[in-house]
Interface confidence: low
């Protein structure tokens, strides 16, 4: 049978020819009578066998990462006969690997984000190297991570590549680094072959610095006559970290007035201070006011890192600004009754000047020609007022500042009329009134009602009598229904049309005024031929055929 | 420079489990091997076992059966656990550095604790 | 296991004289991987040599150390008062790790 023992070929041998093994038949007894060949890919050509010794030498340089064995074919002949004295056998030239490959690292660029101030251990990321040589063939591929560059600040796990944090790092003091790893391979001794790759680690930013003020103090100056709404100064605070982490928010923290507010430009980060409310130069010429600046967004364990919050002082100082008349209401009521005779005081307004000087004030008035006013803002008649021409009179009066006349302000004067029992009661409208000729005594002729112009505090009472001065009159009655109207009854049975066509009846109206005034109103009926019917319907147009000299039967 | 400091109770029921904490001050944990020996009253040193930083441990075989030993980076300490103790296990502990890149797969222990006794004892 | 033996179990020599202690493995140790410790009472180990013979940081020269394969000597050129002490010779060639029962080193 064959023998031989496993075979095995360093690669990259430099000699010119290398003894790999022997292949051997155990009926080979030496006497040169065999004759041993090689056949498959690389026989001849990379490996030679000795014919006689079938001692086999490889006779090229050979590459293991390139092809890492050879499967080849032995036979044996008997050199007398020809034939073959064993088996042709396959078998197996291994290359065996040396360290000629130094580590690469196939993912570059590596780059890592980490946040600032991450404790020790703190993973950053992992590099990993590749090396062609066997990983089973002692240590030529068994990797070992150093750093060459990027002490203090992190360290490298030596089999696995693992970068993590060794000391703490600001990103405000620098925010990358560089680091260079070096792999070895046979686990770093001697003969090793290395490969670096530079590894760029940016910090992240975290909040760990809050926000300080530029300046310890600021000051302002406000024109009193400023809206509300006004920006009155800038101030600026500043924060090391970046982004979200320094977004500041302003806010007052003295001003029990509650006079100022703070609101953020959110472009440069200056906290603008506005007005509130009106101020009053003439109250307080100056504000004394403490400004506090935080950041928006702090994590619970930056905390720390914020208590004790920056604040400034700001000093704001209000500019006098002549300012216009202020009247002591917004606006005036005043009340007069009517029928007083001109010159009569109404009431008086007052305007004063708001500034130190206090300069003395003109007064106008318009809206009505029957009142003026004197420069101490009193207020007369000109006319004699009636309620029942105007109850009410609504006036502007204007004050002017003598040592401006530029400085104007107005207030509305408003002056009710009271009414007073000037006006007595009378009839509410004009009454045409017929009786039929043939009417019977009793019969109603006219129901009357009254009005007065006089504005009553109660409900108007009026009282309807028959004038005592009519006394040739007692064809017909009157009698007061006591609801403000009265009736007009026929006094007797039949009336004649030719003989007395109309009758005047002379009423006394009176109102319930204190002094109650009367008045005298005659009523007019006119005789009307009614026929059977005693309907006066068609009386007004015999009336009017009658004015004008017909004649109806 | 490296200092190495033990420490646990210093009495142990038999059966019961005995701990130790040894504490790395004046370096990091990590790159090394940390190894445990004890030595019985009057007697010769026996090692234990060892520790890489990562967690892979390599323990004596007449040993290995009850001993545990782990690793805590985040606090530059490794521990010592073994279990169901005899009075043959009463011992002076020590713990100590060796390098595994200065020659070879071990290396002699160049840094040492001061030791800890610990007495099984009921 | 390698086991190592040390020999004498205990030495008397004076302060000036020369001490020289064995160790023998029981297999060959690999790479000279073999190391000496001294320890006195109360204190722990403190090595001396390793790698059979390169003496540790801060070791005086009259320590030196020689061998390889199964036998390992350490030698003190003139003893010191301070010398007198136990030393421990160790394997590290092969696991587990081993030390001998050491060599007690008393002053005469």
């Known amino acids: 049978g064959w023998v031989w023992n496993q075979f095995f070929v360093p690669e990259e041998m430099n000699t010119t020819s290398h003894h790999i093994g022997q292949l051997r038949s155990d009926l080979d007894n030496g006497n040169n009578s065999f004759q041993y060949k090689l056949l498959g890919a690389g026989a001849g050509s990379t490996f030679i066998i000795d014919e006689r010794t079938g001692d086999i030498y490889a006779i090229q340089k050979l590459d293991r990462e390139e092809r890492s064995l050879y499967i080849l074919r032995a036979q044996v002949i008997d050199i007398a006969t020809g034939r073959a004295v064993e088996p042709e056998s396959e078998f197996v030239i291994k290359v065996s690997d040396i360290n000629d490959n130094e580590p690469k690292f196939l993912d570059e660029p590596y780059e890592a984000i980490v946040p600032e101030m991450s404790p020790e251990g703190t993973l950053v990321i992992q590099v990993t190297a590749s090396d062609a040589d066997d990983p089973s063939s002692g240590n030529n591929a068994r990797l070992l991570y150093s750093l060459l560059q990027g002490q203090p600040y992190f360290s490298v796990e030596p089999t696995t590549g693992v970068i993590r944090i060794s000391s703490k790092m600001d990103r405000e003091l620098q925010d990358e680094y560089w680091v260079i790893i070096q792999a070895k391979d046979m686990i770093g001794q001697p003969g090793a072959l290395s490969g670096t790759t530079s590894v760029l680690i940016k910090l992240s930013d975290v909040n760990d610095n809050k926000p300080i003020f530029k300046e310890s103090f600021y000051r302002f100056t406000i024109s009193e006559s400023a809206p509300i709404g006004t920006s009155i100064g800038k101030i600026m605070a500043y924060d090391d970290d970046i982004g979200e982490n320094a977004e500041m928010e302003y806010s007052i923290e003295d001003d029990d007035s509650k006079i100022f507010d703070i609101i953020i430009d959110n472009d440069t980060q200056e906290g603008i201070v506005i007005l509130k409310k009106k101020v009053d130069f003439e109250q307080q010429s100056y504000y004394g006011i403490r400004a506090k600046v935080k950041n928006c967004h702090v994590d619970e364990e930056l905390a720390p890192a914020h208590v004790n919050a920056s604040t400034t002082y700001i000093k704001v100082q209000v500019e006098d600004e002549d300012e216009p008349p202020v009247f002591l209401l917004p606006y005036y009521i005043l009340e007069i009754p009517e029928g007083k005779p001109y010159g009569t005081i109404v009431g008086t307004v007052s305007a004063t000047d708001p500034d130190r000087r206090q300069s003395p004030m003109r007064y106008y008035l318009t809206g009505s020609k029957m009142f003026d006013i004197n420069d101490n803002g009193t207020i007369i008649t000109t006319n004699m007022l009636d309620r029942e021409v105007s109850a009410w009179y609504n006036l502007t009066v204007t004050a002017t500042e003598t040592y401006n006349v530029q400085q104007i302000s107005s207030a509305h004067v408003y002056v009710q009329v009271f009414n007073i029992n000037d006006n007595a009661p009378e009839f509410s409208q004009f009454y045409e009134t017929y009786v039929c000729e043939n009417a019977e005594s009793g019969e109603i002729v006219q129901i009357i009602s009254a009005i007065d112009r006089d504005e009553s505090i109660e409900d108007h009472h009026f009282y309807f009598n028959h004038s005592l001065e009519d006394t040739n009159n007692s064809s017909f009655m009157l009698t007061d229904n006591q609801d403000n109207t009265a009736v007009i009854l026929s006094n007797r049975t039949g009336f004649n049309l030719k003989e007395e066509p109309v009758f005047y009846m002379i009423i006394l109206i009176a109102d319930n005024g204190i002094p109650s005034l009367t008045s005298t109103n005659t009523l007019t009926i006119q005789v009307c031929d009614c026929g059977d019917s005693r309907n006066t319907e068609t009386c007004a147009n015999k009336g009017l055929l009658f004015i004008m000299g017909f004649r109806t039967e | 420079q490296v200092q190495l400091q033990e420490s646990g109770p210093g009495l142990v029921k038999p059966s019961e489990t005995l701990s130790l904490t040894c504490t790395v001050s004046?370096?990091?944990?990590?790159?090394?091997?940390w190894s445990w020996i004890r030595q019985p009253p009057g007697k010769g040193l026996e090692w234990i076992g060892y520790?890489?930083?990562?967690?892979?441990?390599n323990y004596n075989p007449s040993l290995k059966s009850r001993v545990t030993i782990s690793v805590d980076t985040s606090k530059n300490q490794f521990s010592l656990k073994l279990s169901s103790v005899t009075a043959a296990d009463t011992a002076l502990y020590y713990c100590?550095?060796?390098?595994?890149?200065?020659?070879?797969?071990?290396?002699?222990?160049?840094?040492w604790g001061q030791g800890t006794m610990v007495t099984v004892s009921s | 296991d390698i086991v190592l033996t040390q020999s004498p179990g205990t030495l008397s020599l004076s302060p000036g004289e020369r001490a020289t202690l064995s160790c023998r493995a029981s297999?060959?140790?690999?790479?000279?991987?073999l190391a000496w410790y001294q320890q006195k009472p109360g204190q722990a180990p403190r090595l001396l040599i390793s790698?059979?013979?390169s003496r540790a940081t801060g070791i005086p020269d009259r320590f030196s150390g020689s061998g390889s394969g199964t036998d390992f000597t350490l030698t003190i050129s003139r003893l010191e008062p301070e010398d007198f002490a136990v030393y421990y010779c160790?394997?590290?060639?092969?696991?587990?790790?081993?030390f001998g029962q050491g060599t007690r080193l008393e002053m005469k």
């Open positions: 004046g370096g990091s944990i990590n790159s090394y091997y």
């Open positions: 100590a550095r060796d390098s595994r890149y200065r020659s070879g797969w071990y290396d002699a222990f160049d840094i």
């Open positions: 790698g059979a013979s």
């Open positions: 297999q060959s140790v690999a790479g000279s991987y």
């Open positions: 520790i890489y930083y990562i967690g892979s441990t």
């Open positions: 160790q394997q590290y060639g092969k696991s587990p790790i081993t």
